[in-house]
Amino acid sequence: EAHKSEIAHRYNDLGEQHFKGLVLIAFSQYLQKCSYDEHAKLVQEVTDFAKTCVADESAANCDKSLHTLFGDKLCAIPNLRENYGELADCCTKQEPERNECFLQHKDDNPSLPPFERPEAEAMCTSFKENPTTFMGHYLHEVARRHPYFYAPELLYYAEQYNEILTQCCAEADKESCLTPKLDGVKEKALVSSVRQRMKCSSMQKFGERAFKAWAVARLSQTFPNADFAEITKLATDLTKVNKECCHGDLLECADDRAELAKYMCENQATISSKLQTCCDKPLLKKAHCLSEVEHDTMPADLPAIAADFVEDQEVCKNYAEAKDVFLGTFLYEYSRRHPDYSVSLLLRLAKKYEATLEKCCAEANPPACYGTVLAEFQPLVEEPKNLVKTNCDLYEKLGEYGFQNAILVRYTQKAPQVSTPTLVEAARNLGRVGTKCCTLPEDQRLPCVEDYLSAILNRVCLLHEKTPVSEHVTKCCSGSLVERRPCFSALTVDETYVPKEFKAETFTFHSDICTLPEKEKQIKKQTALAELVKHKPKATAEQLKTVMDDFAQFLDTCCKAADKDTCFSTEGPNLVTRCKDALA
């Protein structure tokens, strides 16, 4: 229903705390360079205004749209052009063009320093002094670095953060309590970020239709006892929620997500037997829990998929009468039978089925033509299964760091023109798939591996889009989202690449590397590895292993030496010479 004042309506629905958090996230995601204090001031002004509208919905400007209100606030920021360049041009436009202009200027890779965690004592002191400001800083710092982070989920992570600090700051050894717990939240939040960015990419490039197909497959796997009408309703609602968040309508998104969670909990009987535990939780935890709830037990009496989609004499008639609905039921039926497949694979199978019907239903004898369609799925299923087996075997053999290095070599050979920092970031993220997925039971590995890889490769595509340098990457990123991962996997050494000349300074290290945290040391070594491959794209695995072992030995020796500086300055050039010889 229409409300006299949209801002009053959302304030009432969400409550002050969530309202303020979401407005802060929205501003931080739009204007990523502004300080926390600048945004906090705007948030307070918007909140005070919302309260006046709650008191009197007819008050001046209360009938304005949220985009108009928020956009006017952002455009009133002083020195907008100096700080944001052409983003300031958005302010010359009217709504809704202005908001969509802001959206198009969101930066997936803002030049902001990494979000450093203060040491435990300092963190606990500032948390105790002002928990609200502390959490505000967290929302601001995450949101500006991840401009598409799923806003209601970010509120959930802030709540987790809050609970961890409340618990650990009361302990004697704050550090050992905080570190593992906060590391866990950070890891989950980073995965959440790339997954949501993939959803927004799908919406932006391929539309709601593509996202809804993704949602139907995913929901059908999780809720195999729900009927098609129920799955369609959930998919439609979930599409609306994600569309709103991806479009910057964060208050509507959070409100509608809460409504969806409420609906699911009120209709457990027709959805799934596994929801009760989630439904007993408070709002943010409930919605988060529902989003990753375990799959319901599959009905025991499901007929073979062939009955309705291959053997039925009316296949072409049913398809012609309502293509979207017929393909939707196919995707639903296939997905509910295959919780062990990735959503990407299920969508590829549905695409193959559609292409087969398009071709066969135009022929003289359609059933003879589409009769073998399920057998034709086999190679499409085998390819990701082999990928999982090969990569998990390699991960088990090498461990996470070694596995990341193997991926780094592979991807540098596929796309040597891509910047080294991007290749290292991608390889490190891709390599984490081992730790994340390879330890899972067999039937959960494929969906975990492929859907995670797809999300990481989406980020590679977004970064490459800004400065396209590799035809290989452009080719894979231009196709449909579900074909990206197979496209990247199929890439081989880029034969068009002219190797980089050997620069000694690229491989020259100093004693400061010794005091770096382990993660930073790894990044330094991986940067050197990518540069080696760019210098010798056809180096064998054995050659690269020799060089990297030598390099590790050099670091170990010099970092243990009494006079580190001398060791680095004398042994460094020897290492460079040995590298050149080993790769000659």
């Epitope: 959206l103 198009q104 239709r209």
Partner: nanobody, 124 residues
């Protein structure tokens, strides 16, 4: 291949009304999002109004309350009712269809199909 054909343009006095129509050649139209854009001489193409396949609407601020977008799925047609026309509404009006239902509605690259345009001239 979807074809879009606009009609209803013409010359009208300031304050007057016109109703533009856009007929689509395919049934798939009912699942597409539709929009009207306009282009005045020497200016960029500008978004005017959008209607989601389920019926929700979005308007450019300066036409809100004056223009109404609607659709008749049985006739595969989308309409733009323009009241209280102003001199600055003079432009070629284009109908556009987005079969994928993309997220950015004011951006012309979100649309797969375009009509050839119909001229609207508002005189004083």
């Amino acid at each position: 291949q979807v074809q879009l054909v606009e009609s209803g343009g013409g010359l009208v006095q300031a304050g007057g009304s016109l109703r533009l129509s856009c007929a689509a050649s395919e049934r798939a139209f009912s699942h597409s999002n539709m929009a009207w854009f306009r282009q005045a001489p020497g200016k960029e193409r500008e978004f005017v109004a959008h209607i989601h396949w389920r019926g929700s609407t979005t308007y450019l601020d300066s036409v809100k309350g004056r223009f109404t977008i609607s659709r008749d799925n049985a006739k595969n047609t989308v309409y733009l009712q323009m009241n209280g026309l102003r001199l600055e509404d003079t432009a070629v009006y284009y109908c556009a269809a987005d079969s994928a239902r993309r997220i950015l509605v004011t951006v012309s690259t979100s649309y797969d199909y375009w009509g050839q345009g119909t001229q609207v001239t508002v005189s004083s």
